[in-house]
Interface confidence: low
C-alpha cells in the first residue's frame, strides 16, 4: 500500500537502530572516500528528519522519495567535485537518473588502505567507551570497501562483531579470544561480499529474469518438497529484495527481506521441514539462517524427469504455449532432484534444454530430435565433476598455499597481461576453494566449488572491465555468467603474449620482509612467482618449483641471520642469478 511518507514508513518498520545502520551503509557505499564523521553527521540529519516525518507525515518534504532525500543530502556535501571528480556531475541530474548515475560511479576496487584491525586492548577500550560509534566505524569501513555488500547481511555481521567483542573484552586474554573469532567473521563476510556482487552483476548485466532463474534453481535445491508455485513466489520475492539492494534501495531491501523471512516462517509446512530452528531466532539471525539453511530431504517418490520433459507427447505444445513457465518447471524439477549440482550447472542444463526445444520443435519429427536431450547433458555434467576431482586432488596434495601457487601459475599463463596484484588476489581467493569446499562430503563439493569459483571470477571480470588488457579475459567475461567458469577453465597459455624482460629489482628483497605477517610474506612470494611466469610463460612446473624452493630457502636463511641486511644484499644478487639460470 502507498504511504504518505516513505521515510516515516521505513523508520517505523525498521526501528531506529537498523534505520541508522542502513542509511550509513548507503552513504558509505555511494561516497566511498568520505570519512566516518562526515557520514555520521549526514546519518544523524536524515534520522532527525525521519523522526519529524513520523510525528507528522504531512511535514515539509516528508512526501519525497528516499532517492530524492538521500541524493539531495549527498549532493550538499562540500568539495564534492574536488574529492569525487565526475561523480559530482550526477548532482546535475533529476531522479531517477541521478541515482543511476551514483550507482555507475560505485568503485569495486577503491584505493583505500586495507582495513587494519587494531590490537585487542585498543579495540576493547574504544568498544567499551562507545559501542555505537565503534560499530558505526565497522559498517562504514566495510561498506565503502564493498559497495555492493548486502546491507541487511552487513547488519548481521556487525551484530556478530558486537557479540564477539562483548564476550572477549571481558576475558583476561582478549587477543586469543578475539583473533580466531573475528577472523572467522571476516572470512564469511568476504565470501558474502563476492557472492552478492555476483548477484548484482547478474541483475545489472542480464536483468531480473536471469536472477530469477538463479533463484528458482537455488530454492528448488533447498526446498525440494515445496511445489512450483511456492518456489516461484519465493523466487519473485527474493528477486525483488536483491534488486532493491543492488539498486541502492537499502531500506526497502531490508524491510522486504524481513517480510520474506516472516512469510517463510509462517508457511513452513508448504516450504520445508528444516526452517524451525532459524525461525526461532531474532530478525537478523533468522534471515541469515534462512539464507543458508540445509536442504530439506528430497521426496522419495519423484518420477523420472523424462516423463514430462522428453516422453510427453505435448512437450512442444506446452513449450510454445508458455515458454518461461515450461522452462521454469523444467529448472524446478531438475534442480530439486539435484542438490549435488551447482546452480551454474543447472542453469547451463536449462539453457541446453531450451536450445534443444527451440531447434527441435521447428522440425518435422520433434520427439525424435529432442529424445536424446538428457543424454546430451552428460558432457556438461562431467566437465565440472572432473574439475572438482582434479582440483581437490591437487589441493589435498599441496595444501592451501601450494594450491594457490599452482592456480597463480595457471592463471598467469592464461592472462599474463593482467596486473600482478589482480592475479595474486584472484589466485589466493580461487585457492581458498580447497579449504572451503574440498573437505565437504562428496555430494556438496560440486555446488560449493563451482558457485564459489564463479563468484571469484566475476570479481576478476569487474576489475578487468576497468582496464581491459587481455583478450582471453575479455572473451570469457563477455559471455553469460554461467559460461564464465568453463570458459576460464578452458583457457590455455596465451600464445600472443610477448614475455616481460627480466628485471633484477622485481626479485630483489630486503630485510623488512622478515617482520611481515605470514599472509604478507606469502603475497610477496606469490608476486615474485607471477612475475617469473610473466618472464617465462612456458616455464615448466619443475623449473618454477626449483626457483620458488630456492627463494624460500633464501628468505629463511637471511631472516635467521644475525646481520639480515648484509645477508639480503649479498645473497640477493646470487639468488637472482640462479633464478635466471634455472629458467634459461
Amino acid at each position: 500500500e502507498a504511504h504518505k511518507s516513505e521515510i516515516a514508513h521505513r523508520y517505523n518498520d525498521l526501528g531506529e537502530q537498523h534505520f541508522k545502520g542502513l542509511v550509513l551503509i548507503a552513504f558509505s557505499q555511494y561516497l566511498q572516500k568520505c570519512s566516518y564523521d562526515e557520514h555520521a553527521k549526514l546519518v544523524q540529519e536524515v534520522t532527525d528528519f525521519a523522526k519529524t516525518c513520523v510525528a507528522d507525515e504531512s511535514a515539509a518534504n516528508c512526501d519525497k522519495s528516499l532517492h530524492t532525500l538521500f541524493g539531495d543530502k549527498l549532493c550538499a556535501i562540500p568539495n564534492l567535485r574536488e574529492n569525487y571528480g565526475e561523480l559530482a556531475d550526477c548532482c546535475t541530474k533529476q531522479e531517477p537518473e541521478r541515482n543511476e548515475c551514483f550507482l555507475q560511479h560505485k568503485d569495486d576496487n577503491p584505493s583505500l588502505p586495507p582495513f587494519e584491525r587494531p590490537e585487542a586492548e585498543a579495540m576493547c577500550t574504544s568498544f567499551k567507551e562507545n559501542p555505537t560509534t565503534f560499530m558505526g566505524h565497522y559498517l562504514h569501513e566495510v561498506a565503502r570497501r564493498h559497495p555492493y555488500f548486502y546491507a541487511p547481511e552487513l547488519l548481521y555481521y556487525a551484530e556478530q562483531y558486537n557479540e564477539i567483542l562483548t564476550q572477549c573484552c571481558a576475558e583476561a586474554d582478549k587477543e586469543s579470544c578475539l583473533t580466531p573469532k573475528l577472523d572467522g567473521v571476516k572470512e564469511k563476510a568476504l565470501v558474502s561480499s563476492v557472492r552478492q556482487r555476483m548477484k548484482c552483476s547478474s541483475m545489472q548485466k542480464f536483468g531480473e529474469r536471469a536472477f530469477k532463474a538463479w533463484a528458482v534453481a537455488r530454492l528448488s535445491q533447498t526446498f525440494p518438497n515445496a511445489d512450483f508455485a511456492e518456489i516461484t513466489k519465493l523466487a519473485t520475492d527474493l528477486t525483488k529484495v536483491n534488486k532493491e539492494c543492488c539498486h541502492g534501495d537499502l531500506l526497502e531491501c531490508a524491510d522486504d527481506r524481513a517480510e520474506l523471512a516472516k512469510y517463510m516462517c509462517e508457511n513452513q509446512a508448504t516450504i520445508s521441514s528444516k526452517l524451525q530452528t532459524c525461525c526461532d531466532k531474532p530478525l537478523l539471525k533468522k534471515a541469515h539462517c534462512l539464507s543458508e539453511v540445509e536442504h530439506d530431504t528430497m521426496p522419495a517418490d519423484l518420477p523420472a524427469i523424462a516423463a514430462d520433459f522428453v516422453e510427453d507427447q505435448e512437450v512442444c505444445k506446452n513449450y510454445a504455449e508458455a515458454k518461461d513457465v515450461f522452462l521454469g518447471t523444467f529448472l524446478y524439477e531438475y534442480s530439486r532432484r539435484h542438490p549435488d549440482y551447482s546452480v551454474s550447472l543447472l542453469l547451463r542444463l536449462a539453457k541446453k534444454y531450451e536450445a534443444t526445444l527451440e531447434k527441435c520443435c521447428a522440425e518435422a519429427n520433434p520427439p525424435a530430435c529432442y529424445g536424446t536431450v538428457l543424454a546430451e547433458f552428460q558432457p556438461l555434467v562431467e566437465e565440472p565433476k572432473n574439475l572438482v576431482k582434479t582440483n581437490c586432488d591437487l589441493y589435498e596434495k599441496l595444501g592451501e598455499y601450494g594450491f594457490q601457487n599452482a592456480i597463480l601459475v595457471r592463471y598467469t599463463q592464461k592472462a599474463p597481461q593482467v596486473s600482478t596484484p589482480t592475479l595474486v588476489e584472484a589466485a589466493r581467493n580461487l585457492g581458498r576453494v580447497g579449504t572451503k569446499c574440498c573437505t565437504l562430503p562428496e555430494d556438496q563439493r560440486l555446488p560449493c566449488v563451482e558457485d564459489y569459483l564463479s563468484a571469484i571470477l566475476n570479481r576478476v571480470c569487474l576489475l578487468h572491465e576497468k582496464t581491459p588488457v587481455s583478450e582471453h579475459v575479455t572473451k570469457c567475461c563477455s559471455g553469460s555468467l554461467v559460461e564464465r567458469r568453463p570458459c576460464f577453465s578452458a583457457l590455455t597459455v596465451d600464445e600472443t603474449y610477448v614475455p616481460k624482460e627480466f628485471k633484477a629489482e622485481t626479485f630483489t628483497f630486503h630485510s623488512d620482509i622478515c617482520t611481515l605477517p605470514e599472509k604478507e610474506k606469502q603475497i610477496k612470494k606469490q608476486t615474485a612467482l607471477a612475475e617469473l611466469v610473466k618472464h617465462k610463460p612456458k616455464a615448466t612446473a619443475e623449473q618454477l618449483k626449483t626457483v620458488m624452493d630456492d627463494f624460500a630457502q633464501f628468505l629463511d636463511t637471511c631472516c635467521k641471520a644475525a646481520d639480515k641486511d648484509t645477508c639480503f644484499s649479498t645473497e640477493g644478487p646470487n639468488l637472482v642469478t640462479r633464478c635466471k639460470d634455472a629458467l634459461a
Epitope: T297, P299, A300, D301, L302, P303, A304, A307
Partner: nanobody, 115 residues
C-alpha cells in the same frame, strides 16, 4: 519401452494377507522411487505407499499405516507390497507407478476383500 506388470492379487477374507509384486523393465529400476496406487470401483486413484530408489525411505497413506509394508529388490527389478489385516475397504485394483504419480501406466492387479 517402460513396462510395469503387477501380480499377486486375488480374493481374500477380512483379516487375511496378500503379497503383491510389480516386475519392472525398460528403465533403470534402481534409480527411481516407486509407489503403489489403488483405485476402488467408481472412485479416483488413491496413493497407497512409496519407497525411495535405495529402499531406505518408505511412506504410507494413513489408511494403510501399520498394516501394509512396501519393499523392493533392485537386483530382481521388482517392487512388493505386503498387505496384512485386510479390510473390505481395501478392495480395489492395485497398480505400481514410477515416483509418486497416480497416473496409471499399467493394467494393475485386482484385490477383493470379502467374506
Amino acid at each position: 519401452q517402460v513396462q510395469l506388470v503387477e501380480s499377486g492379487g486375488g480374493l481374500v477374507q477380512p483379516g487375511g494377507s496378500l503379497r503383491l509384486s510389480c516386475a519392472a523393465s525398460g528403465f533403470t529400476f534402481g534409480s527411481f522411487g516407486m509407489s503403489w496406487v489403488r483405485q476402488a470401483p467408481g472412485k479416483g486413484p488413491e496413493w497407497v505407499s512409496a519407497i525411495d530408489s535405495g529402499g531406505a525411505d518408505t511412506r504410507y497413506a494413513e489408511s494403510v499405516k501399520g498394516r501394509f509394508t512396501i519393499s523392493r529388490d533392485n537386483a530382481k527389478k521388482t517392487l512388493y507390497l505386503q498387505m496384512n489385516s485386510l479390510k473390505p475397504e481395501d478392495t480395489a485394483v492395485y497398480y505400481c507407478t514410477i515416483g509418486q504419480s497416480t497416473s496409471r501406466g499399467s493394467q494393475g492387479t485386482q484385490v477383493t476383500v470379502s467374506s
